[in-house]
């Protein structure tokens, strides 16, 4: 819990440089996100493919989409879970991080120093050990987050199943209902290829309790979809006389000293015929 108050932002006096004053863990160990670069990567053959169970949500069911003032968050059902980690990790929510229309590079994790346009986080909690995500969030092995790197490219109908509801959650505190759909459609190709490390929540209280899985391959959304995400939302309530756009809601990469990120893939890319000389 914060020392005093719970106000935090990505910009201004309550921005990330100040987080650790109220949330000590933000200045502590195992902080996320990080830059994924070759010096810190190590192949681990034991990192087998994850199984995504209960991810195909029925459209007959309603799921709550919320503007929480920091991101747009979709609540997920507790019977949706990951198989293949040491414990069962049940889903609790997904949310996104992004940049702004003039600098559309708002992913949290970077690869070789490069940002992607945006990033999706699917948050799970250890349901073998803990009754809910809130209880699990400050416990060892408590959380597991799947991170999907998003780049600009072709239109993505699956992501639009979220984006098409953004106009109903324009302001902080607003909520809308979204029909269930197959959440696995939000994941990239070849999900067996991923980066794995122990880290933290990327937002206050920055608990160092997250097992991160960052998929190697990005997904694409269109320029129009990205622009909708970057321009649709506000961090402030509808009646706030000083509205603040919800942009650049990503944390800077954190120091990652004397630690390794494990990969489920060997780093050598398969050479193409054109690449041989």
């Amino acid at each position: 819990a914060p020392v005093n108050g719970s106000k935090w932002t990505y910009f201004g006096p309550d921005g990330e440089n100040s987080w650790s004053k109220k949330y000590p863990s933000c200045g502590g160990l195992l902080q996320s996100p990080i830059d994924l670069h070759s010096d810190i990567l190590q192949y681990d053959a034991s990192l087998t493919p994850l199984e995504f169970q209960g991810y195909n949500l029925s459209a007959n069911k309603q799921f709550l989409l919320t503007n929480n003032g920091h991101s747009v968050k979709l609540n997920l059902p507790s019977d949706m879970h990951i198989q293949g980690l040491q414990s069962r990790y049940s889903a609790t929510q997904l949310h996104l991080h992004w940049g702004n229309p003039n600098d559309p590079h708002g992913s949290e994790h970077t690869v070789s120093g490069q940002h992607f346009a945006a990033e999706l986080h699917i948050v799970h909690y250890n349901s073998d050990l803990y009754p809910d995500a809130s209880t699990a969030s400050n416990k060892s092995e408590g959380l597991a987050v799947l991170a999907v790197l998003i780049e600009m490219g072709s239109f993505n109908p699956s992501y639009d199943k979220i984006f098409s509801h953004l106009q109903h959650v324009k302001y902080k505190g607003q909520e809308a209902f979204v029909p269930g759909f197959n959440i696995e459609e939000l994941l990239p190709e070849r999900t067996a290829e991923y980066y794995r490390y122990r880290g933290s929540l990327t937002t206050p209280p920055c608990n160092p309790t997250v097992l991160w899985t960052v998929f190697r391959n990005p997904v694409q959304i269109s320029q129009e979809q990205l622009l909708a995400l970057e321009t649709a939302l506000y961090c402030t309530h509808m009646d706030d006389p000083s509205p603040r756009e919800m942009i650049n809601n990503f944390r800077q990469v954190q120091k990652f000293d004397e630690r390794l990120v494990y990969t489920s893939f060997s780093q050598v890319q398969v050479c193409t015929a054109a690449g041989l000389s």
Partner: antibody, heavy 121, light 106 residues
């Protein structure tokens, strides 16, 4: 035939609590959420909350958070609404209902017959 | 919360009359749904997705509108149409209903 049947209504003292039941039949119970909607005498309809019978996950109208609890017994195909700290304004017919998806959103295609709760001393 | 205001609250009309009920939302909604309720009975779905009639609803009923303004129209009122009609939105949480329009016999 798809059916929802409510029970458990009656006279309750102010400050008391109620537990209503909604028994479902005629369809695959865990495939649809169950909603509770109430209607005060001569008034409009008001949504209380819903439950996903597959996993017990609940969502409430903020107005009733902390005072209403919805639960489910999958083995009986029955959902329950418990409401505490009742006051006269809670006097209403309480309905359970099932929403169905039609391609964009949902509508309530099946309603129970309703059960009347009267809060009075 | 999105407030739904129906007008009129009640109306008296004769068999054969054309009747229009309006529903205004305090914020834009994607679709509007309408329910029909007889005294002492549960509501019945009547029109969904603004303009689609539920199976079994007579074609004299129609629905239209977009954004914040929606209407239910009965082209030629019949004796069985005397009831209370409620609009409902599902775009935002909490889902909300209008206060109802009671259609009575003149």
């Amino acid at each position: 035939e798809v059916q929802l049947v409510e029970s458990g209504g009656g006279l309750v003292q102010p400050g008391g609590s109620l537990r209503l039941s909604c028994a479902a039949s005629g369809y695959s119970y865990t495939d649809y959420n169950i909603y509770w909607v109430r209607q005060a005498p001569g008034k409009g309809l008001e949504w209380v909350g819903y439950i996903d019978p597959a996993n017990g996950d609940t969502t409430y109208n903020q107005k009733f958070k902390g005072r209403a609890t919805i639960s489910v017994d999958k083995s009986k195909n029955t959902a329950y609404l418990q409401m505490n700290s009742l006051r006269a304004e809670d006097t209403a017919v309480y309905y359970c209902s099932r929403p169905i998806y039609y391609g964009a959103y949902w509508y309530f295609d099946v309603w129970g017959q309703g059960t009347l709760v009267t809060v009075s001393s | 919360d999105i407030q739904m205001t129906q007008s009129p609250s009640s109306l008296s009309a004769s068999v054969g009359d054309r009747v229009t009920i309006t529903c205004r939302a305090s914020s834009s909604v994607t679709y509007m749904h309408w329910y029909h309720q007889k005294p002492g009975k549960a509501p019945k779905p009547w029109i969904y997705a603004t303009s689609s009639l539920v199976s079994g609803v007579p074609s004299r009923f129609s629905g239209s509108g977009s954004g914040t303004d929606f209407t239910l129209t009965i082209s030629s009122l019949q004796p069985e149409d005397f009831a209370t009609y409620y609009c409902q939105q599902w775009s935002s949480n909490p889902l909300t209903f209008g206060q109802g329009t009671k259609v009575e016999i003149k």
